[in-house]
């Protein structure tokens, strides 16, 4: 992948919408939308003040925590999906979706070099991933969405500035 | 129940400073970002800054830079602010604001007002 | 920086629907909240990321955000509801808070 693809907006945009309109598809289901367990899903609130003063070493190892634990729980997903009895039509095709999109994203995060971004100290120190539970498709696809606006842009935003200097 | 109770009003003159203050009663207060919002006489709101009061990290408004500080005080769940250099375009109601987190926000949002502290700067 | 943009104002007669709308670039992109401010009172959250409903607000109150546009949506409009519409987003870019320019809902009669 191009090293600053993720720097252009609107490849973030797409993947943003994607997880959107996942979301808004999945509100109106419930018991077909239903995971039937409880998945663990990184916990996407951001204190945007503490947040801003943060090492972008710091904020790279929550990003790549969360991403990995988000990737996990959308497979995990998948597998309840491929499981199930009479699965929600439009899921599988957002499940597909989210799947590619964690693929795609992780790759351009890989070539903006954001690994490298992870100081040995900063991946000591940091504080264990804030974790929560998802039980339906859609606190699954609400998280995914969450994340992409709020951790995930706010550090490529900041790694993206600090490239351009 | 959150409240939030601010000082009384205050009358000011051009190149002077103001301090309004904050106190938060229900809930815990280290645990919410406090924002602070004016509104001149018949127009619309206007985000000045805010501050965490765990970390005592403030953030402000480009508008603002360098006029207001916002603080904390833990002991007594206050927040304040203050607005120096004073002009009559200042004129205006300030509100401090709680952001809270909804379920499914990953953003706090304004959930919490105080009834707001009308500044009045005039020569 | 970012910039929402809301009619000034919008009437409509009770038991209607009042639609107010907020527009800005990519606004999907973004979460918009919405408060109600009443004559001499401090806001008040009606809806927040985009479309969900603090407690206490009541049902007739929804958002949407899609296109190029948020919208406010209050169906079977009562006198109460008459009062000033502020949409809001977190804009990350410049890490600050925006507001639109509210919009004045009148209710006729």
């Known amino acids: 992948a191009p090293p600053r693809l993720i720097c252009d907006s609107r490849v973030l945009e797409r993947y943003l919408l994607e997880a959107k309109e996942a979301e808004n598809v999945t509100m109106g289901c419930s018991e077909s939308c239903s995971l039937n367990e409880n998945i663990t899903v990184p916990d996407t609130k951001v204190n945007f003040y503490a947040w801003k003063r943060m090492e972008v070493g710091q904020q790279a190892v929550e990003v790549w925590q969360g991403l990995a634990l988000l990737s996990e729980a959308v497979l995990r997903g998948q597998a309840v999906l491929a499981n199930s009895s009479q699965p929600f039509e439009p899921l599988q095709l957002h499940m597909d979706k989210a799947i590619s999109g964690l693929r795609s994203i992780t790759t351009l995060l890989r070539a903006l070099g954001a690994q490298e971004a992870i100081s040995l100290p900063d991946a000591a120190s940091a504080a264990p991933l804030r974790t929560i539970t998802a039980d339906t498709f859609c606190k699954l696809f609400r998280v995914y969405s969450n994340f992409l606006r709020g951790k995930l842009k706010l550090y490529t935003g900041e790694a993206c500035r600090r490239g351009d200097r | 129940q959150v409240q939030l109770v601010q000082s009384g009003a205050e009358v000011k003159k051009p190149g002077s400073s103001v301090k309004v203050s904050c106190k938060a009663s229900?809930?815990?207060?280290?645990?919410?970002?406090i924002s602070w919002v004016r509104q001149a006489p018949g127009q619309g709101l206007e985000w000045m800054g805010g501050?965490?009061?765990?970390?005592?990290?403030?953030d402000y408004a480009q508008k603002f830079q360098g006029r207001v500080t916002i603080t904390a005080d833990e002991s007594t769940s206050t927040a304040y602010m203050e607005l120096s250099s004073l002009r009559s375009e200042d004129t205006a109601v300030y509100y401090c604001a709680r952001e809270l987190y909804y379920p499914g926000t990953w953003m706090a949002v304004m959930a919490y007002w105080g009834r707001g502290t009308l500044v009045t700067v005039s020569s | 920086s970012y910039v929402l943009t809301q009619p000034p104002s919008v009437s409509v007669a009770p038991g209607k629907t009042a639609r107010i709308t907020c527009s800005g670039d990519?606004?999907?992109?973004?979460?918009v909240h919405w408060y109600q401010q009443k004559p001499g009172q401090a806001p008040v959250l009606v809806i927040y990321?985009?479309?969900e409903r603090p407690s206490g607000i009541p049902e007739r109150f929804s958002g949407s955000n899609s296109g190029n546009t948020a919208t406010l949506t209050i169906s079977r409009v009562e006198a109460g509801d008459e009062a000033d519409y502020y949409c809001q987003v977190f804009d990350e870019s410049s890490w600050h808070w925006v507001f639109g320019g509210g919009t004045k809902l009148t209710v006729l009669g």
């Open positions: 990321r985009d479309n």
């Open positions: 990519n606004i999907p992109e973004y979460y």
């Open positions: 501050i965490d009061p765990i970390s005592g990290f403030a």
């Open positions: 229900g809930g815990t207060f280290r645990s919410y970002a």
